[in-house]
């Protein structure tokens, strides 16, 4: 997270260079329930244009998260070729991407991109500052399709239960065996009539000291 915030400083504030479309995005969004609405606002009216609006993940924009393809006379086409669950909505100077089922590890910086294909000339945007999407999901792992604890959780519970029962049985059996063998040893012992002596001091076993972990050092 900290790295992303630092990386944002690498991008200067938006300036116009030639015939470029300017893009405005929220600096940061938090996805509490694994879903988020990211609005890309353009300095351009898209309504009478054939355009391709896309959302890219990562500082290098390597992952194309979602694409909204629009043509003034046709219905909006929204798709993702990278497995994201996304939808899109068009305003006259904006495209809103609705991302769902986000995972915690998809916390990253996301960039809006716009390309006007028709009529010419071809236009695209000046790179925006991006939006950090911080996914605060309910699940640490990829979220299951159904609510409640996942299958691996139940498997662990069952396996854990079986192992616990097994170890309990083994322990009980061992104790019974040990008590019986001790009793039989006492009955046949040559030292039965000796007076007992006080034993010497027993060695105490201390838990070795483990310094507390500096969790702050692990935060990113």
């Amino acid at each position: 997270m900290l790295r992303l915030l630092l990386a944002l400083n690498l991008f200067p504030s938006i300036q116009v260079t030639g015939n470029k479309i300017l893009v405005k995005q929220s600096p940061m969004l938090v996805a509490y329930d694994n879903a988020v609405n990211l609005s890309c606002k353009y300095s351009y009216n898209l309504f009478s244009r054939e355009f391709r609006a896309s959302l890219h993940k990562g500082l290098d924009s390597a992952v194309e998260v979602c694409v909204v393809y629009g043509n003034y006379s046709q219905q909006l086409q929204v798709y993702s070729k990278t497995g994201f669950n996304c939808d899109g909505k068009l305003g006259n100077e904006s495209v809103t991407f609705y991302l769902q089922n986000l995972y915690v590890n998809q916390t990253d910086i996301y960039f809006c991109k716009i390309e006007v294909m028709y009529p010419p000339p071809y236009l695209d945007n000046e790179k925006s500052n991006g939006t950090i999407i911080h996914v605060k999901g309910k699940h640490l792992c990829p979220s299951p399709l159904f609510p409640g604890p996942s299958k691996p959780f139940w498997v662990l519970v069952v396996v854990g239960g079986v192992l616990a029962c097994y170890s309990l049985l083994v322990t009980v059996a061992f104790i019974i065996f040990w008590v019986r063998s001790k009793r039989s040893r006492l009955l046949h012992s040559d030292y039965m009539n000796m007076t007992p002596r006080r034993p010497g001091p027993t060695r105490k076993h201390y838990q070795p000291y483990a310094p507390p972990r500096d969790f702050a050092a692990y935060r990113s």
Epitope: N45, F47, S48, S73, P119, P120, P121
Partner: antibody, heavy 121, light 107 residues
Framework: KVQLQQSGAGLVKPGASVKLSCKAS????????INWVKQRSGQGLEWIGW????????NYNEKFKDKATLTADKSSSTVYMDLSRLTSEDSAVYFC??????????????WGQGTTLTVSS | DIQMTQSPASLSVSVGETVTITCRTS??????LAWYQQKQGKSPQLLVY???KLADGVPSRFSGSGSGTQYSLRINSLQPEDFGSYYC?????????FGGGTKLEIK
């Protein structure tokens, strides 16, 4: 200063062809669409089509598809319109106009002075 | 193709008056509309684009309004140089059709 200079008036015979020119100056020629507009005497304006010098792409009004042919010469920053099989219906003033994209809203911001075409035997 | 219905076709008014010219489109053009003024024997000149935005150098007595399929051009306190013909034009997909025009004459 942006200017669109059109070729002079012409008198042509029915059935013949004519080539009208529109020379652009004062801006980057390949960055803007050039349109052609027809206006018959005392009538309104009719959009014929556009030519984009940057890629050579063309868009015609269906009504003029078999009548007009748009071309360009980048070296002289000139767009041409060929009108074929001329009839008296083609007698009109023809304007070229530059299309400006203002943040996704279009307009014809600069116009040529017009070329008067008279088709008569 | 989108049909453009401009009204009135002609208008006879006096200097100082206010006039409104309307343009109706056959479908929603989302404000992709321009207005032009043309004087006799001259080329058209851009007045308004994006339905409401005034082009550079156009006097503030001119104003554009409207949305959807209804648009209008208003000229406050008409000046002698305002007389001529006015045309609307849509840019919602080609062909970029013009309205039939409104001829503004001095009364």
């Amino acid at each position: 200063k942006v200017q669109l200079q059109q070729s002079g008036a012409g008198l042509v015979k029915p059935g013949a062809s004519v080539k009208l020119s529109c020379k652009a100056s004062g801006y980057t020629f390949s960055d803007y669409i050039i349109n052609w507009v027809k206006q018959r005497s005392g009538q309104g304006l009719e959009w014929i089509g556009w030519f984009y010098p940057g890629s050579g792409s063309i868009n015609y009004n269906e009504k003029f598809k078999d009548k007009a042919t748009l071309t360009a010469d980048k070296s002289s920053s000139t767009v041409y319109m060929d009108l074929s099989r001329l009839t008296s219906e083609d007698s009109a003033v023809y304007f070229c106009a530059r299309r400006e994209d203002r943040g996704g809203y279009d307009a014809f911001d600069y116009w040529g002075q017009g070329t008067t075409l008279t088709v008569s035997s | 193709d989108i049909q453009m219905t401009q009204s009135p076709a002609s208008l006879s008014v006096s200097v100082g008056e206010t006039v409104t010219i309307t343009c109706r489109t056959s479908e929603n053009i989302y404000s992709n509309l321009a207005w032009y003024q043309q004087k006799q024997g001259k080329s058209p000149q851009l007045l308004v684009y994006a339905a409401t935005k005034l082009a550079d150098g156009v006097p503030s007595r001119f104003s554009g309004s409207g949305s959807g399929t209804q648009y209008s051009l208003r000229i406050n306190s008409l000046q002698p140089e305002d007389f001529g013909s006015y045309y609307c034009q849509h840019f919602w997909g080609t062909p970029w059709t013009f309205g039939g025009g409104t001829k503004l004459e001095i009364k």
